[in-house]
Interface confidence: low
């Protein structure tokens, strides 16, 4: 347990950690080893993890072997009604396991995000709840109607709609970012959000950008050909300049735009990318902000509620504001 | 770089109310608090409250409660304090501070302070 | 919440000075320090214990341990000379009476 004798490590690689866990050199400097969390034993081995303000309270100073990881005044948590503290790590459902750091809460998908296409074996995918379980599903309807599965279906894919695995290692901090968060608004200008920790603190915190689905003026039904029930993404028929609080884009863009369907399915993004705009606005003020371009939408039954947990959750409270 | 600007001395009679402006430029206003503090002359450094614009929350020292009034204004990106039933002890320059509750609560831009004098 | 600190601190040009700020289980909260020169508003040194904020000289270290948190100053000044207050959280803001550092 303590540090006197010579540094030996398993031989295996550096353990991985589960998500939100740093990954920490011990408290010898010999190994790296998962941090300790909230309320968990801690020695000068296994130390707690510093990245949520955590230390190793040993209580009487005679007793230096083994100690309870405690947090320190970082700012608590408010979520669902419950005050978290820093360093706490809980599950708000069996979607998402969450840790309040310093008054953010992040919170990672423990459920399978993906976006499954339409393919030849499965035309009309679906995410369903099963009884017992709490991840939602994809399940396949019986086609209905034989003549939408034709060669334009022929490129199944099963994918992360979000990129690569969030998750990744630099210099002793789990760098973890959320998946950017459906569109405030189905048309229109919105806004999307993630949480990260992808900074050279390895602090929490929320990060923006606009968006646009499609927009509101457009009537997109008008124009789903004869026979079909969607349009995944009309095609562009002029460029645009992107309106914002009275500010105009001071460029034009060819942007693509999600279309619509008429049997219940919705369209959404599918791959994004993020790109800086600059606005102009009538006082002759410039301001940049990123915004999320479209690069494909999918037509899916798994259609966005108003279910964005990052949304409500951001806002931070600190123990005075109990009273 | 933000740039907190507070409004000019005052001087007042006790038992009356005094309210200091406090307006942020050049940074994100409501996603901080704005925390006040008081120095008495000769004296350190006491807390008297803040305000989280983006919730509209406040909260008080306990030896303030009742007596201050912090308030703030998003469009303007000013906030505001108020002290009332002032008393000769309340003498001192008034400083706001932005109060950057993501790390723990830093104090990192002050305004320029505001001095208050309670007299007959 | 009570945090005390010595009322004065006097340090030779080039020596290390340290201001102690003692609190009942202080290693147990994080300790912001503050520099307050005469007729100026005061300016954050270190955050978190031991963070130095931008800008701020490495001269300026800060440590915490057990009921006592130190800010030392290295290499002292003569536009060190300023007083210094250590400030904790504890349901509010709480600050030490302060420490005049003099440097002759």
């Known amino acids: 347990q303590n540090c006197s004798g010579p540094c030996r490590c398993p031989d295996e690689p550096a353990p991985r950690c589960p998500a939100g866990v740093s990954l920490v050199l011990d408290g010898c400097g010999c190994c790296r080893v998962c941090a300790k969390q909230l309320g968990e034993l801690c020695t000068e081995r296994d130390p707690c993890d510093p990245h949520k303000g955590l230390f190793c309270h040993f209580g009487s100073p005679a007793n230096r072997k083994i100690g309870v990881c405690t947090a320190k005044d970082g700012a608590p948590c408010i979520f669902g009604g419950t005050v978290y503290r820093s360093g706490e790590s809980f599950q708000s459902s069996c979607k998402y396991q969450c840790t309040c750091l310093d008054g953010a809460v992040g919170c990672m998908p423990l459920c399978s995000m993906d976006v499954r296409l339409p393919s030849p074996d499965c035309p009309f995918p679906r995410r369903v709840k099963l009884p017992g379980k709490c991840c939602e599903e994809w399940v396949c309807d019986e086609p209905k109607d034989q003549t939408v599965v034709g060669p334009a279906l022929a490129a199944y894919r099963l994918e992360d709609t979000f990129g690569p695995d969030p998750t990744m290692i630099r210099a002793n901090c789990l760098v973890q970012t959320t998946e950017w968060s459906a569109c405030s608004k189905t048309c229109g200008m919105g806004i999307s959000t993630r949480v990260t920790n992808d900074n050279a603190s390895c602090r929490l915190e929320k990060q923006s950008r606009l968006c646009m689905v499609r927009p509101c003026e457009a009537d997109l039904e008008e124009n789903i050909k004869k026979g079909k029930k969607c349009i995944r993404t009309p095609k562009i028929s002029k460029p645009i300049k992107f309106e914002l609080s009275g500010c105009t884009s001071m460029k034009t863009y060819r942007a693509k735009f999600c279309g619509v369907c008429t049997d219940g399915r919705c369209c959404t993004p599918h791959r994004t990318t993020t790109l800086p705009v600059e606005f102009k606005c009538p006082d002759g003020e410039v301001m940049k902000k990123n915004m999320m371009f479209i690069k494909t939408c999918a037509c899916h039954y798994n259609c966005p509620g108003d279910n964005d947990i990052f949304e409500s959750l951001y806002y931070r409270k600190m123990y005075g504001d109990m009273a | 770089q933000m740039q907190l600007v507070q409004s000019g001395a005052e001087v007042k009679k006790p038992g009356s109310s005094v309210k200091v402006s406090c307006k942020a430029s050049g940074g994100t206003f409501s996603s901080y608090a704005i925390s006040w503090v008081r120095q008495a002359p000769g004296q350190g450094l006491e807390w008297v409250g803040r305000i989280i614009p983006i919730l509209g929350i406040a909260n008080y020292a306990q030896e303030f409660q009742g007596r201050v009034t912090i308030t703030a204004d998003k469009s303007t990106s000013t906030a505001y304090m108020e002290l009332s039933s002032l008393r000769s002890e309340d003498t001192a320059v008034y400083y706001c501070a932005r109060d950057d509750i993501a790390v723990a609560g830093n104090f990192d831009y002050w305004g320029q302070g505001t001095l208050v004098t309670v007299s007959s | 919440y009570v945090l005390t600190q010595p009322s004065s601190v006097t340090v030779s040009p080039g020596q290390t000075a340290r201001i102690t700020c003692s609190g009942d289980l202080l290693a147990k909260k994080y300790v912001r320090w503050l520099q307050q020169k005469p007729g100026q508003a005061p300016v954050l040194l270190i955050y978190?214990?031991?963070e130095r904020l931008s800008g701020i000289p490495e001269r300026f270290s800060g440590s915490n341990s057990g009921n006592m948190a130190t800010l030392t100053i290295s290499r002292a000044q003569a536009g060190d000379e300023a007083d210094y207050y250590c400030q904790v959280w504890d349901s509010s803001w709480v600050f030490g009476g302060g420490t005049e550092l003099t440097v002759l």
């Open positions: 978190k214990d031991s």
